[in-house]
Amino acid sequence: ESGYAQNGDLEDAELDDYSFSCYSQLEVNGSQHSLTCAFEDPDVNITNLEFEICGALVEVKCLNFRKLQEIYFIETKKFLLIGKSNICVKVGEKSLTCKKIDLTTIVKPEAPFDLSVVYREGANDFVVTFNTSHLQKKYVKVLMHDVAYRQEKDENKWTHVNLSSTKLTLLQRKLQPAAMYEIKVRSIPDHYFKGFWSEWSPSYYFRTPEINNSSGEMDPI
């Protein structure tokens, strides 16, 4: 671990901020798990920097990350999924900074998909449905979903609804008539596993019906 003292680049490197963050994705590719890490500071010179994870692995001491542009990435079946691993930023054999992380507490689910909205004329409501790959998984099965919707003209006025199922009913009377709405959904682990919100699903756009003047109800699209 010595032998670098005369290396001016390394001495400079030790003054830098190598703080980093990571997230895990379980069964992201069949039975393979992934771990992704990146530096908090986008200006860090990553030329000679490597990431390594040691501990809480199956029948190996350590694994090295692959570098993909600005991120570092591992895909493996060898996570024990219990206890803390030691994740280190390294230059050669020297560790610059390390963090002990339990991979089950930094899980980022895959984004939901197939989001759609169907208007039910008789019920005067909108049925929102979406899908998640996590229904088929062995580990991160229980998720909390965050459905966010807004009137397209209201840039930052999102309304959020949390739910554990993949179906939501929006009452017509709670929405503006004859308006275009944008809706999207994301997920977070909600049982045993902990972590971060997934990326947002692709947005879905729908229009609310006009108000029928005689009855005060909206016309269907």
Epitope: E1, G55, A56, K61, L80, L81, I82, K84, D102, Y192
Partner: antibody, heavy 119, light 105 residues
Framework: QVQLVQSGAEVKKPGASVKVSCKAS????????MNWVRQAPGQGLEWMGL????????SYNQKFKGRVTLTRDTSISTAYMELSRLRSDDTAVYYC????????????WGQGTTVTVSS | EIVLTQSPATLSLSPGERATLSCSAS?????MHWYQQKPGQAPRPLIY???KLASGIPARFSGSGSGTDFTLTISSLEPEDFAVYYC????????FGGGTKVEIK
Amino acid sequence: QVQLVQSGAEVKKPGASVKVSCKASGYTFTGYTMNWVRQAPGQGLEWMGLINPYNGVTSYNQKFKGRVTLTRDTSISTAYMELSRLRSDDTAVYYCARGDGDYWYFDVWGQGTTVTVSS
Amino acid sequence: EIVLTQSPATLSLSPGERATLSCSASSSVTYMHWYQQKPGQAPRPLIYEISKLASGIPARFSGSGSGTDFTLTISSLEPEDFAVYYCQEWNYPYTFGGGTKVEIK
């Protein structure tokens, strides 16, 4: 209090198999690894393998791979170690030990199970 | 696989004396643990992660070291400290040293 209670002593013939149990109490069984360590008479300690009780994932010492099988029954908070194709040099005390997942040391040990292999 | 060599194999000391036990690794180890074992008993943890005292362990026990060289020190031996001591690496395959027996002189 946290406790690991192992099954009783066994006498086996060469070529046979032995299955040792380890019942955990006083903590959440699925929250810690269960490790197995053996000690031959007058010798040091040798780690054999571990199991993650939450998902059944195992990690074995290469020396024992193929001969040792670790399993668990979460409904009764019990871990099992089965060693097959027994030889006389498998005569030892077999310990189960809870693994502390923050620091990876064995913080709680069973009382040990003596396995004697003799023809 | 890392080999842990403990020295001396036997340490003969009197109660009240200071005991210094060494554990040398064949390659660099991030963390080291220490256990005590008495005849007919299971091992019990003494020191984890190089220098942290396990639950219920008296302060006369201390650990130090880094890289390939680690030390367990007992500042003043009590009668109940005469036992065998093992070092162990924190990572797969969780190798133990051969042990140091601390006996009464």
